[in-house]
Amino acid sequence: LTCLGGFASPGPVPPSTALRELIEELVNITQNQKAPLCNGSMVWSINLTAGMYCAALESLINVSGCSAIYRTQRILHGLCPHKVSAGQFSSLHVRDTKIEVAQFVKDLLLHLKKLFREGQFN
């Protein structure tokens, strides 16, 4: 079970619920955009494999002052089993490739959708 810190509902949240919540949030932040997501900030691309939640958080946590992704960061905090802080990098980062947050979100969202359809919640 995964515990999502900072969420309104207390107690542990099943991984399937957390994954669905993350998908819904990513879709939400891409809808009806009036300005570029996070002002066009760039983040490190990641390998969408095991440890993906922590790697995604490590990339996104380095984006400051972007309220649009605060909730995404919070959900990822709950899905990542270890503490992540800014400036931290894992081997899952494609360190030579930086992409816009908007593109990062598309890549992550597609991968999460595939996991959800396949029933891979962990």
Epitope: L26, V27, T30, Q31, Q33, K34, A35, P36, L37, G40, T97, E100, A102, Q103, V105, K106, D107, L109, L110, K113, K114, R117
Partner: antibody
């Protein structure tokens, strides 16, 4: 409702540079990726490239040396320049908006026919 | 470079089910999008990210994607479904780019 409108010359001479403009209305140009796609008569779709409001571009490698894309957020317009035109570049040229949540194209212009001939 | 292969044509009787395939190396790992294009018109998105449908697109249109083949399925085919259909993917590599399939002409006989 987002609307895209391509404009430019219908006829271009060989070796000249094609300049097309795509005007976007009903939505902000600065929050999405935008692409140019072309289609020769009776043939399939060919992606030319994409641009983001930051000016960052990705181009089709087979056209890269001839393509320049730009974006003018103040006018809500995109532009495409394709140099050294040949008869093989004769096609309907479309601009399209990349969806916010995927790499699909959710809005397209009606297309503009460009013929290369002397 | 990445190649998407579609059959040039598919024929189906009204009321039957049409299946249009799109083949590509390990395409199951990519998000596949499908477009319908009628003569003289711009393409219209009918399925995105393998199996999601944009608003306004009938439930008769569905998609699947695994292994080396993606499939667009149109159930209870109508005469108005006759069109060209294109699959499309985003190739995320050192050279980010978009690839379209060659297109499939769906004929309702």
């Amino acid at each position: 409702q987002v609307q895209l409108q391509e404009s430019g010359p219908g006829l271009v001479k060989p070796s000249e540079t094609l300049s097309l403009t795509c005007s976007v209305s009903g939505g902000s140009i600065s929050s999405y990726y935008w692409s140019w796609i072309r289609q020769p008569a009776g043939k399939g779709l060919e992606w030319i490239g994409r641009i983001y409001m930051t000016g960052r571009t990705n181009y089709n490698s087979s056209l890269k040396s001839r393509v320049t894309m730009s974006i003018d957020t103040s006018k809500n317009q995109l532009s495409l320049k394709l140099s050294f035109m040949t008869a093989a570049d004769t096609a309907v040229y479309y601009c399209a908006r990349e969806s916010g949540s995927s790499y699909s194209y959710d809005y397209w212009g009606q297309g503009t026919l460009v013929t290369v001939s002397s | 470079s990445y190649v998407l292969t579609q059959p040039p044509s598919v024929s189906v009787a009204p009321g039957q089910t049409a299946r249009i395939t799109c083949g590509g190396n390990n395409i199951g790992s990519k998000g596949v999008h499908w477009y319908q294009q009628k003569p003289g018109q711009a393409p219209v998105l009918v399925v995105y990210d393998d199996s999601d449908r944009p608003s306004g697109i009938p439930e008769r249109f569905s998609g699947s994607n695994s292994g080396n083949t993606a499939t667009l399925t149109i159930s209870r085919v109508e005469a108005g479904d006759e069109a060209d259909y294109y699959c499309q993917v985003w190739v995320s590599s050192s050279d980010h780019h978009v690839v379209f399939g060659g297109g499939t002409k769906l004929t309702v006989v």
